[in-house]
Protein backbone atom coordinates (compact mmCIF):
# COMPACT_ATOMS: atom_id res chain seq x y z
CA UNK A 1 0.00 0.00 0.00
CA UNK A 2 0.80 3.23 -0.66
CA UNK A 3 1.56 6.00 1.81
CA UNK A 4 0.00 9.25 1.46
CA UNK A 5 0.34 12.57 3.64
CA UNK A 6 -1.46 15.83 2.82
CA UNK A 7 -1.03 18.92 4.61
CA UNK A 8 -4.32 20.94 6.09
CA UNK A 9 -4.92 24.58 4.95
CA UNK A 10 -7.38 26.14 7.33
CA UNK A 11 -8.17 30.23 5.94
CA UNK A 12 -10.80 32.82 6.36
CA UNK A 13 -12.92 34.36 2.91
CA UNK A 14 -10.57 36.49 1.11
CA UNK A 15 -7.60 35.00 1.98
CA UNK A 16 -4.96 33.46 -0.51
CA UNK A 17 -3.35 29.70 -0.37
CA UNK A 18 -0.37 30.05 -1.45
CA UNK A 19 1.61 26.71 -1.41
CA UNK A 20 4.30 24.44 -4.03
CA UNK A 21 4.49 21.32 -5.20
CA UNK A 22 8.43 19.93 -5.74
CA UNK A 23 9.20 18.04 -8.98
CA UNK A 24 12.55 16.38 -10.15
CA UNK A 25 14.08 18.80 -11.96
CA UNK A 26 15.75 17.22 -14.85
CA UNK A 27 12.60 14.68 -15.81
CA UNK A 28 9.64 17.21 -15.28
CA UNK A 29 10.72 20.99 -15.76
CA UNK A 30 9.07 21.28 -19.16
CA UNK A 31 6.02 18.83 -18.55
CA UNK A 32 3.25 20.14 -18.10
CA UNK A 33 1.41 20.29 -15.12
CA UNK A 34 -1.90 20.99 -13.39
CA UNK A 35 -4.01 21.49 -10.24
CA UNK A 36 -6.59 19.04 -9.21
CA UNK A 37 -9.31 19.00 -6.86
CA UNK A 38 -10.31 15.65 -5.59
CA UNK A 39 -13.79 15.34 -4.55
CA UNK A 40 -15.17 12.09 -2.64
CA UNK A 41 -16.07 9.26 -4.87
CA UNK A 42 -15.22 11.22 -7.64
CA UNK A 43 -12.35 11.01 -10.18
CA UNK A 44 -9.75 14.60 -9.61
CA UNK A 45 -10.74 17.27 -11.72
CA UNK A 46 -8.37 19.15 -13.23
CA UNK A 47 -8.93 22.97 -12.53
CA UNK A 48 -6.10 24.52 -14.36
CA UNK A 49 -2.69 23.30 -15.59
CA UNK A 50 0.62 25.19 -17.24
CA UNK A 51 0.96 25.85 -20.93
CA UNK A 52 2.64 22.43 -22.69
CA UNK A 53 5.40 22.42 -22.39
CA UNK A 54 5.60 24.61 -19.78
CA UNK A 55 7.27 28.00 -19.46
CA UNK A 56 9.69 28.99 -16.87
CA UNK A 57 7.72 31.17 -14.59
CA UNK A 58 5.57 32.61 -16.86
CA UNK A 59 2.16 32.80 -14.77
CA UNK A 60 -1.13 31.05 -16.02
CA UNK A 61 -4.34 32.31 -14.52
CA UNK A 62 -7.72 30.76 -14.85
CA UNK A 63 -10.11 32.48 -12.83
CA UNK A 64 -8.95 32.94 -9.03
CA UNK A 65 -5.99 30.24 -9.92
CA UNK A 66 -2.58 31.03 -10.92
CA UNK A 67 0.61 28.79 -11.42
CA UNK A 68 3.56 29.71 -12.11
CA UNK A 69 6.12 26.86 -12.80
CA UNK A 70 9.60 27.78 -11.52
CA UNK A 71 12.09 25.38 -13.63
CA UNK A 72 14.92 26.05 -12.06
CA UNK A 73 13.63 25.96 -8.51
CA UNK A 74 11.91 22.59 -9.42
CA UNK A 75 8.94 23.34 -7.89
CA UNK A 76 5.00 24.11 -9.27
CA UNK A 77 3.29 27.67 -7.20
CA UNK A 78 -0.28 27.16 -6.91
CA UNK A 79 -2.02 30.02 -6.00
CA UNK A 80 -5.58 30.32 -5.22
CA UNK A 81 -6.86 33.80 -4.18
CA UNK A 82 -9.68 35.54 -2.83
CA UNK A 83 -11.56 32.19 -1.31
CA UNK A 84 -14.30 30.78 -1.18
CA UNK A 85 -15.97 28.69 1.57
CA UNK A 86 -16.90 26.28 -1.62
CA UNK A 87 -13.33 26.10 -2.37
CA UNK A 88 -12.91 24.15 0.86
CA UNK A 89 -11.70 20.64 -0.47
CA UNK A 90 -8.66 17.97 -1.28
CA UNK A 91 -6.40 19.05 -4.08
CA UNK A 92 -3.44 17.72 -5.53
CA UNK A 93 -0.55 18.40 -8.19
CA UNK A 94 0.18 15.94 -11.42
CA UNK A 95 2.62 15.91 -14.31
CA UNK A 96 0.81 15.14 -17.44
CA UNK A 97 3.55 12.66 -19.25
CA UNK A 98 1.61 11.27 -22.07
CA UNK A 99 0.95 7.97 -23.30
CA UNK A 100 1.87 6.96 -19.35
CA UNK A 101 -0.98 8.66 -16.47
CA UNK A 102 -0.57 11.70 -15.16
CA UNK A 103 2.19 11.69 -11.85
CA UNK A 104 0.63 13.05 -8.61
CA UNK A 105 3.36 14.96 -6.52
CA UNK A 106 3.12 14.91 -2.58
CA UNK A 107 1.75 16.22 -0.37
CA UNK A 108 -2.13 16.68 -1.22
CA UNK A 109 -3.45 19.85 0.25
CA UNK A 110 -6.67 19.81 2.40
CA UNK A 111 -7.98 23.23 2.22
CA UNK A 112 -10.53 24.46 4.65
CA UNK A 113 -12.23 27.99 4.00
CA UNK A 114 -14.13 29.45 6.59
CA UNK A 115 -16.22 32.18 6.65
CA UNK A 116 -15.49 35.11 8.56
CA UNK A 117 -12.98 38.32 7.92
CA UNK A 118 -9.49 37.79 6.74
CA UNK A 119 -8.58 40.35 8.27
CA UNK A 120 -7.53 41.19 12.73
CA UNK A 121 -9.09 38.05 14.31
CA UNK A 122 -11.36 39.34 16.48
CA UNK A 123 -12.66 42.36 14.24
CA UNK A 124 -15.90 43.62 14.56
CA UNK A 125 -18.87 43.49 12.05
CA UNK A 126 -17.59 46.85 10.59
CA UNK A 127 -13.95 45.33 9.57
CA UNK A 128 -13.79 45.12 5.61
CA UNK A 129 -12.45 42.09 4.16
CA UNK A 130 -9.68 41.75 2.51
CA UNK A 131 -10.57 40.75 -0.94
CA UNK A 132 -7.85 41.05 -3.45
CA UNK A 133 -9.26 42.47 -6.78
CA UNK A 134 -7.82 39.52 -9.56
CA UNK A 135 -6.13 41.42 -12.60
CA UNK A 136 -7.54 40.41 -16.08
CA UNK A 137 -6.49 36.51 -17.00
CA UNK A 138 -3.18 36.87 -19.41
CA UNK A 139 -2.74 33.03 -20.38
CA UNK A 140 -5.26 30.32 -19.99
CA UNK A 141 -3.96 26.92 -21.22
CA UNK A 142 -5.81 24.14 -22.60
CA UNK A 143 -5.48 20.89 -20.28
CA UNK A 144 -5.74 17.30 -22.17
CA UNK A 145 -8.54 14.84 -21.51
CA UNK A 146 -6.90 11.98 -19.93
CA UNK A 147 -9.06 8.57 -20.28
CA UNK A 148 -7.47 5.54 -18.59
CA UNK A 149 -8.39 1.45 -18.10
CA UNK A 150 -7.53 2.35 -14.66
CA UNK A 151 -10.17 3.41 -12.03
CA UNK A 152 -10.49 4.71 -8.91
CA UNK A 153 -13.52 3.60 -7.00
CA UNK A 154 -12.88 6.11 -4.27
CA UNK A 155 -11.27 9.43 -3.37
CA UNK A 156 -9.21 9.64 0.02
CA UNK A 157 -12.05 9.57 3.14
CA UNK A 158 -11.85 12.92 4.78
CA UNK A 159 -9.83 12.59 7.75
CA UNK A 160 -10.97 12.89 11.00
CA UNK A 161 -7.99 13.52 12.90
CA UNK A 162 -6.95 16.37 14.52
CA UNK A 163 -4.57 18.21 12.34
CA UNK A 164 -4.86 21.70 12.77
CA UNK A 165 -0.82 22.39 13.46
CA UNK A 166 1.23 23.47 10.57
CA UNK A 167 3.41 20.13 11.30
CA UNK A 168 0.72 17.69 11.25
CA UNK A 169 -0.23 15.69 8.86
CA UNK A 170 -2.69 12.97 7.52
CA UNK A 171 -0.98 9.60 6.62
CA UNK A 172 -3.51 7.83 4.88
CA UNK A 173 -2.69 4.10 5.08
CA UNK A 174 -4.38 1.28 2.68
CA UNK A 175 -5.13 3.24 -0.18
CA UNK A 176 -3.61 1.56 -3.76
CA UNK A 177 -3.11 1.93 -7.31
CA UNK A 178 -3.93 6.01 -6.13
CA UNK A 179 -0.93 7.61 -7.05
CA UNK A 180 -0.92 6.96 -11.10
CA UNK A 181 -4.48 8.79 -11.71
CA UNK A 182 -6.50 9.71 -14.84
CA UNK A 183 -7.74 13.38 -15.06
CA UNK A 184 -11.27 14.24 -15.80
CA UNK A 185 -12.25 17.98 -17.12
CA UNK B 1 11.43 18.46 19.28
CA UNK B 2 13.06 20.45 16.01
CA UNK B 3 16.48 21.72 16.48
CA UNK B 4 18.67 24.01 14.01
CA UNK B 5 22.09 23.88 15.53
CA UNK B 6 24.56 25.96 13.70
CA UNK B 7 28.61 26.07 14.06
CA UNK B 8 30.44 28.41 15.60
CA UNK B 9 31.74 32.04 14.88
CA UNK B 10 34.11 32.45 12.42
CA UNK B 11 36.60 35.00 11.35
CA UNK B 12 37.87 35.75 8.31
CA UNK B 13 40.24 37.52 5.81
CA UNK B 14 38.95 40.09 2.95
CA UNK B 15 38.72 37.19 -0.26
CA UNK B 16 38.68 34.47 1.53
CA UNK B 17 35.76 31.64 2.04
CA UNK B 18 33.69 30.40 4.48
CA UNK B 19 31.43 27.42 5.01
CA UNK B 20 28.83 27.20 7.88
CA UNK B 21 26.79 24.13 8.87
CA UNK B 22 23.35 23.81 10.28
CA UNK B 23 22.63 20.44 12.03
CA UNK B 24 18.73 19.66 11.60
CA UNK B 25 17.08 17.00 13.73
CA UNK B 26 13.68 16.16 15.48
CA UNK B 27 12.26 15.75 12.10
CA UNK B 28 12.95 14.49 8.76
CA UNK B 29 15.69 16.60 7.28
CA UNK B 30 14.50 15.77 3.54
CA UNK B 31 10.93 17.16 3.67
CA UNK B 32 11.37 20.79 4.57
CA UNK B 33 13.26 23.39 2.58
CA UNK B 34 16.44 25.06 4.70
CA UNK B 35 16.95 28.69 4.15
CA UNK B 36 19.95 31.13 4.81
CA UNK B 37 19.29 34.44 6.33
CA UNK B 38 21.72 37.29 7.23
CA UNK B 39 21.72 40.31 9.56
CA UNK B 40 25.05 42.26 9.01
CA UNK B 41 25.21 45.34 12.13
CA UNK B 42 22.72 47.78 11.85
CA UNK B 43 21.14 46.21 9.15
CA UNK B 44 17.94 43.95 8.75
CA UNK B 45 17.34 40.71 7.67
CA UNK B 46 18.21 39.73 4.22
CA UNK B 47 17.10 36.08 2.57
CA UNK B 48 20.25 35.11 0.90
CA UNK B 49 18.68 31.57 -0.40
CA UNK B 50 16.69 28.26 -0.23
CA UNK B 51 18.07 24.99 -0.33
CA UNK B 52 15.74 21.46 -1.12
CA UNK B 53 17.72 19.23 0.82
CA UNK B 54 15.31 16.29 -1.21
CA UNK B 55 16.93 17.54 -4.58
CA UNK B 56 19.78 19.17 -3.31
CA UNK B 57 18.66 22.06 -5.61
CA UNK B 58 19.13 25.90 -4.53
CA UNK B 59 17.54 29.18 -4.97
CA UNK B 60 19.50 31.99 -4.80
CA UNK B 61 18.89 35.78 -4.40
CA UNK B 62 19.76 38.02 -7.10
CA UNK B 63 22.66 39.51 -5.14
CA UNK B 64 24.30 36.55 -3.93
CA UNK B 65 24.33 34.57 -7.27
CA UNK B 66 27.82 33.34 -8.34
CA UNK B 67 29.32 33.64 -4.28
CA UNK B 68 26.86 31.45 -2.47
CA UNK B 69 27.02 28.22 -2.33
CA UNK B 70 24.11 25.79 -0.52
CA UNK B 71 24.85 22.76 -0.35
CA UNK B 72 23.94 19.42 2.13
CA UNK B 73 24.83 15.80 3.44
CA UNK B 74 21.74 14.00 4.48
CA UNK B 75 23.27 11.10 5.97
CA UNK B 76 24.05 13.82 8.76
CA UNK B 77 21.20 15.41 8.14
CA UNK B 78 23.19 19.06 7.79
CA UNK B 79 23.11 21.65 5.62
CA UNK B 80 25.59 24.26 4.29
CA UNK B 81 26.40 27.54 3.52
CA UNK B 82 29.39 28.25 1.89
CA UNK B 83 30.30 32.42 0.62
CA UNK B 84 33.22 33.07 -0.90
CA UNK B 85 35.12 36.08 -2.24
CA UNK B 86 34.65 37.53 1.48
CA UNK B 87 34.55 41.53 1.55
CA UNK B 88 34.17 43.85 4.92
CA UNK B 89 30.27 44.09 4.00
CA UNK B 90 30.05 39.98 4.82
CA UNK B 91 30.45 40.57 8.41
CA UNK B 92 26.93 39.61 9.55
CA UNK B 93 25.38 36.94 11.55
CA UNK B 94 23.98 34.20 9.31
CA UNK B 95 20.92 31.69 10.55
CA UNK B 96 19.94 28.95 9.25
CA UNK B 97 15.67 28.63 8.86
CA UNK B 98 13.48 25.49 8.35
CA UNK B 99 9.97 26.32 6.58
CA UNK B 100 7.26 25.87 8.42
CA UNK B 101 5.87 23.00 6.55
CA UNK B 102 6.74 20.99 3.49
CA UNK B 103 4.12 22.65 0.55
CA UNK B 104 5.16 26.04 1.61
CA UNK B 105 8.15 28.59 1.14
CA UNK B 106 7.09 30.94 3.61
CA UNK B 107 7.32 31.15 7.08
CA UNK B 108 10.26 30.16 8.95
CA UNK B 109 9.44 28.52 12.36
CA UNK B 110 12.44 27.04 13.31
CA UNK B 111 15.96 29.19 13.24
CA UNK B 112 19.16 28.16 14.73
CA UNK B 113 21.26 30.01 16.93
CA UNK B 114 23.27 31.98 14.84
CA UNK B 115 26.59 32.13 13.39
CA UNK B 116 28.68 35.39 13.66
CA UNK B 117 30.96 35.30 10.28
CA UNK B 118 34.02 38.49 10.93
CA UNK B 119 36.01 39.60 7.80
CA UNK B 120 38.54 41.75 9.05
CA UNK B 121 41.98 42.28 7.85
CA UNK C 1 12.99 42.94 -7.37
CA UNK C 2 10.37 42.51 -5.46
CA UNK C 3 10.14 45.13 -2.33
CA UNK C 4 8.15 45.77 1.04
CA UNK C 5 8.41 48.64 2.52
CA UNK C 6 8.02 49.52 6.28
CA UNK C 7 8.54 52.52 8.55
CA UNK C 8 12.12 52.78 9.96
CA UNK C 9 10.70 53.44 13.46
CA UNK C 10 7.09 53.32 15.71
CA UNK C 11 6.77 54.29 19.26
CA UNK C 12 4.02 53.47 21.71
CA UNK C 13 3.67 53.84 25.20
CA UNK C 14 3.14 50.90 27.95
CA UNK C 15 -0.65 49.25 27.43
CA UNK C 16 -1.21 51.22 23.74
CA UNK C 17 -1.53 49.28 21.01
CA UNK C 18 1.27 49.55 18.28
CA UNK C 19 0.50 49.63 14.36
CA UNK C 20 3.44 48.55 11.97
CA UNK C 21 2.57 48.36 8.71
CA UNK C 22 3.91 46.89 5.37
CA UNK C 23 3.22 47.06 1.83
CA UNK C 24 4.15 45.74 -1.53
CA UNK C 25 2.67 45.35 -5.02
CA UNK C 26 -0.10 42.63 -4.91
CA UNK C 27 0.44 42.26 -1.59
CA UNK C 28 -3.22 41.10 -1.31
CA UNK C 29 -2.46 38.07 -3.43
CA UNK C 30 0.66 36.77 -1.44
CA UNK C 31 0.59 35.37 2.12
CA UNK C 32 2.20 37.66 5.23
CA UNK C 33 4.15 36.89 7.92
CA UNK C 34 5.99 38.41 10.57
CA UNK C 35 9.13 38.30 12.58
CA UNK C 36 10.04 39.48 16.21
CA UNK C 37 13.79 40.22 16.39
CA UNK C 38 15.49 41.27 19.67
CA UNK C 39 19.62 41.79 20.05
CA UNK C 40 21.53 38.78 20.18
CA UNK C 41 18.62 36.74 19.53
CA UNK C 42 17.22 34.64 16.65
CA UNK C 43 14.11 35.94 14.61
CA UNK C 44 11.00 34.57 16.14
CA UNK C 45 7.71 33.56 13.63
CA UNK C 46 4.91 35.86 15.20
CA UNK C 47 2.33 35.96 12.49
CA UNK C 48 2.00 33.73 9.41
CA UNK C 49 -0.83 33.27 7.12
CA UNK C 50 -1.41 37.41 7.68
CA UNK C 51 -3.22 36.54 10.55
CA UNK C 52 -2.22 33.35 12.55
CA UNK C 53 -0.51 33.07 15.98
CA UNK C 54 1.87 30.04 16.27
CA UNK C 55 1.80 28.29 19.38
CA UNK C 56 2.77 30.30 22.77
CA UNK C 57 2.76 34.06 20.55
CA UNK C 58 0.73 35.64 22.88
CA UNK C 59 -2.92 36.89 22.14
CA UNK C 60 -2.05 40.77 22.01
CA UNK C 61 -0.25 40.14 18.32
CA UNK C 62 -2.89 40.05 15.61
CA UNK C 63 -2.46 40.78 12.09
CA UNK C 64 -4.52 41.70 9.58
CA UNK C 65 -4.42 43.24 5.89
CA UNK C 66 -6.25 45.69 3.53
CA UNK C 67 -5.64 45.77 0.23
CA UNK C 68 -1.85 45.30 -0.05
CA UNK C 69 -0.39 47.04 3.37
CA UNK C 70 -0.19 44.31 5.83
CA UNK C 71 -0.55 45.84 9.36
CA UNK C 72 0.87 44.08 12.89
CA UNK C 73 -0.86 44.85 15.81
CA UNK C 74 0.31 44.62 19.22
CA UNK C 75 -2.84 46.05 21.79
CA UNK C 76 -1.65 46.29 25.06
CA UNK C 77 1.93 46.61 24.41
CA UNK C 78 4.33 45.54 26.85
CA UNK C 79 8.00 46.75 27.64
CA UNK C 80 9.16 43.08 26.55
CA UNK C 81 7.70 43.64 23.30
CA UNK C 82 10.22 46.48 21.96
CA UNK C 83 12.30 44.92 19.23
CA UNK C 84 12.67 45.30 15.58
CA UNK C 85 9.78 43.94 13.63
CA UNK C 86 9.88 42.18 10.17
CA UNK C 87 7.29 41.50 7.21
CA UNK C 88 7.79 38.96 4.62
CA UNK C 89 6.73 37.19 1.82
CA UNK C 90 7.34 35.25 -1.22
CA UNK C 91 7.77 36.80 -4.38
CA UNK C 92 9.57 34.44 -6.89
CA UNK C 93 12.09 34.02 -3.55
CA UNK C 94 11.70 35.79 -0.19
CA UNK C 95 11.69 39.13 0.28
CA UNK C 96 11.88 40.32 3.98
CA UNK C 97 10.48 44.47 4.61
CA UNK C 98 13.27 46.98 5.87
CA UNK C 99 12.45 46.19 9.54
CA UNK C 100 10.40 48.41 12.15
CA UNK C 101 12.15 49.25 15.29
CA UNK C 102 9.35 49.27 18.06
CA UNK C 103 10.73 51.16 20.90
CA UNK C 104 7.86 51.04 24.44
CA UNK C 105 8.32 54.61 25.61
Known amino acids: ATKLTEEKYELKEGQTLDVKCDYTLEKFASSQKAWQIIRDGEMPKTLACTERPSKNSHPVQVGRIILEDYHDHGLLRVRMVNLQVEDSGLYQCVIYQPPKEPHMLFDRIRLVVTKGFSGTPGSNENSTQNVYKIPPTTTKALCPLYTSPRTVTQAPPKSTADVSTPDSEINLTNVTDIIRVPVFN | QVQLVQSGAEVKKPGASVKVSCKAS????????IHWVRQAPGQGLEWMGWLNPNSGGANYAQKFQGWVTMTRDTSISTAYMELSRLTSDDTAVYYCARDQRKTTVTPFEYWGQGTLVTVSS | SYELTQPPSVSVSPGQTASITCSGDKLGERNVCWYQLKPGQSPILVIYQDNKRPSGIPERFSGSKSGNTAILTISGTQAMDEADYYCQAWDRNVVFGGGTKLTVL
Open chain 2, 26 to 33: GYTFNGYY
